[in-house]
């Protein structure tokens, strides 16, 4: 197996009860071949379901900064630039993996964590609830 | 846990030249406190910029399966259910972190990798380029 110089307080991976751990190289390789710098950059403003981006920071998480989208309105923007409440703005959400320091504040020990983030908004036709 | 035949060239973390590595517990903790089961589940169909989800599978990546959104139309769906080409359907993209087996086929050695995924689509007003 892999042996690492161990801090006495760090988890013992040889313990049979210890959850499965792996080695991860944190030098990030960027596979984004898309060189278009714009990408989604101005969509938040041009969308019929515009959104604002909010910075979510957590030093115990890697990456520590995640941007969260919040839809500006409950309705959607129509051709006249007004909000049309016959349509709904909804967040497009995605589950992503992050690394959470565990135990807290440990520089070299993490746990994979799944979090739900809102990436942007889209305009949908409302669900009509028919009253019997 | 996952068992994979070990590549004889798997790294020795005691090597001083080995890039910064950390221990990661792969037992995923799910922090999604949002109990709304609907989430984005049916938005892909109800959106004015509908999309299809395509399965992207790669056994050398963790998670091995990622769903990619592809907008169905260049335009957006109008109130009559027709495609309006005066508006544009565009993908909302997000950079996410994944783990890439490195060297390939190693069960316990990964490198962090950043990839760009399309999560869904939104309807935007086109950029009008005026010809001089």
């Amino acid at each position: 197996g892999i042996t690492i110089p161990r801090n006495p307080g760090c988890p013992n991976s040889e313990d049979k009860n210890f959850p499965r751990t792996v080695m991860v190289n944190l030098n990030i390789h960027n596979r984004n071949t898309n060189t278009n710098p714009k990408r989604s950059s101005d969509y938040y403003n041009r969308s019929t379901s515009p959104w604002n981006l909010h910075r979510n920071e957590d030093p115990e998480r890697y990456p520590s900064v995640i941007w969260e989208a919040k839809c500006r309105h409950l309705g959607c923007i129509n051709a006249d630039g007004n909000v049309d409440y016959h349509m709904n703005s909804v967040p497009i959400q995605q589950e992503i993996l992050v690394l959470r320091r565990e135990p807290p504040h440990c520089p070299n020990s993490f746990r994979l964590e799944k979090i739900l983030v809102s990436v942007g908004c889209t305009c949908v036709t409302p669900i009509v609830h028919h009253v019997a | 846990g996952i068992t994979i035949p070990r590549n004889p060239g798997c790294p020795n973390s005691e090597d001083k030249n080995f890039p910064r590595t950390v221990m990661v517990n792969l037992n995923i903790h799910n922090r999604n406190t949002n109990t709304n089961p609907k989430r984005s589940s049916d938005y892909y169909n109800r959106s004015t910029s509908p999309w299809n989800l395509h399965r992207n599978e790669d056994p050398e990546r963790y998670p091995s399966v990622i769903w990619e959104a592809k907008c169905r139309h260049l335009g957006c769906i109008n109130a009559d259910g027709n495609v309006d080409y005066h508006m544009n359907s565009v993908p909302i993209q997000q950079e996410i972190l994944v783990l890439r087996r490195e060297p390939p086929h190693c069960p316990n050695s990964f490198r962090l990798e950043k990839i760009l995924v399309s999560v869904g689509c939104t309807c935007v007003t086109p950029i009008v380029h005026h010809v001089a």
Partner: antibody
Framework: QVQLQESGPGLVKPSETLSLTCTVS????????VSWIRQPPGKGLEWIGI???????DYNSAFKSRVTISVDTSKNQFSLKLSSVTAADTAVYYC??????????????????WGQGTLVTVSS | DIVMTQSPLSLPVTPGEPASISCKSS????????????LAWYLQKPGQSPQLLIY???TRQSGVPDRFSGSGSGTDFTLKISRVEAEDVGVYYC?????????FGQGTKVEIK
């Protein structure tokens, strides 16, 4: 703690521009949006407009042609400008913080902290 | 614009007794995507600025006593004070945050008998 404080001239002449400043402390500007709300003497509350965390704005259409809301993040200050004022613009003007809820994916238009308000009289 | 209509406009109360204020909206404030009603209640005490009591119809803002409760859905909403205390006097406003511009009711003045 969270504080908002409005300041500006208490008297403005008709047809001139009303200019107010809201200085905030105790919260992060990049997270929160701020609205301006007014209350004519003895009357109810009227929402004027909002400036979002990214500097974007949205205005009540009743004021749209003559209102501007801006922010100077270096000074933690928001400003309201209302042009071509008349006696009907006499009111107590409040700046208020829009509530921020972490796991909620819409901008919020409830107001969870208010300034003490400043009375602006429009008179010649 | 959405019209918010409160009743009564004036409410004399006895300390220790319950009190109730009604607010009606000219359009439904129920958002179909999350089943939340976009209605809030504020109290403006004499000489002070308004303070948020309740949002999303029934969620109490932190620090607000549990004698305050909100109910309703769609267009009809109610604020109840289970046992009025002397410090509860002032003008109560309902506010909708569904439609822009975001509008307030005309206010209900609560005073001790």
């Amino acid at each position: 703690q969270v504080q908002l404080q409005e300041s500006g001239p208490g008297l403005v002449k008709p047809s001139e521009t009303l200019s107010l400043t809201c200085t905030v402390s105790g919260f992060s500007l990049p997270s929160h949006s701020v609205s301006w709300i007014r209350q004519p003497p003895g009357k109810g509350l009227e929402w004027i407009g909002i400036i979002w965390n990214n500097g974007g704005t949205d205005y009540n259409s009743a004021f749209k042609s003559r209102v501007t809301i801006s922010v100077d993040t270096s000074k933690n200050q928001f400003s309201l400008k209302l042009s071509s004022v008349t006696a009907a613009d006499t009111a107590v003007y409040y700046c208020a913080r829009n509530m921020y809820i972490t796991d909620y994916y819409y901008e919020n238009y409830f107001f969870d902290a208010w300034g003490q308000g400043t009375l602006v009289t429009v008179s010649s | 614009d959405i019209v918010m209509t409160q009743s009564p406009l004036s409410l004399p109360v006895t300390p220790g007794e319950p009190a109730s204020i009604s607010c009606k909206s000219s359009q439904s404030l129920l958002f179909s995507e999350n089943q939340k009603n976009y209605l809030a209640w504020y109290l403006q005490k004499p000489g002070q600025s308004p303070q948020l009591l309740i949002y999303w119809t029934s969620t109490r803002q932190s620090g607000v006593p549990d004698r305050f409760s909100g109910s309703g859905s769609g267009t009809d909403f109610t604020l109840k004070i289970s046992r009025v205390e002397a410090e509860d006097v002032g003008v109560y406003y309902c506010q909708q945050s569904y439609y822009t511009p975001y509008t307030f009711g005309q206010g209900t003045k609560v005073e001790i008998k």
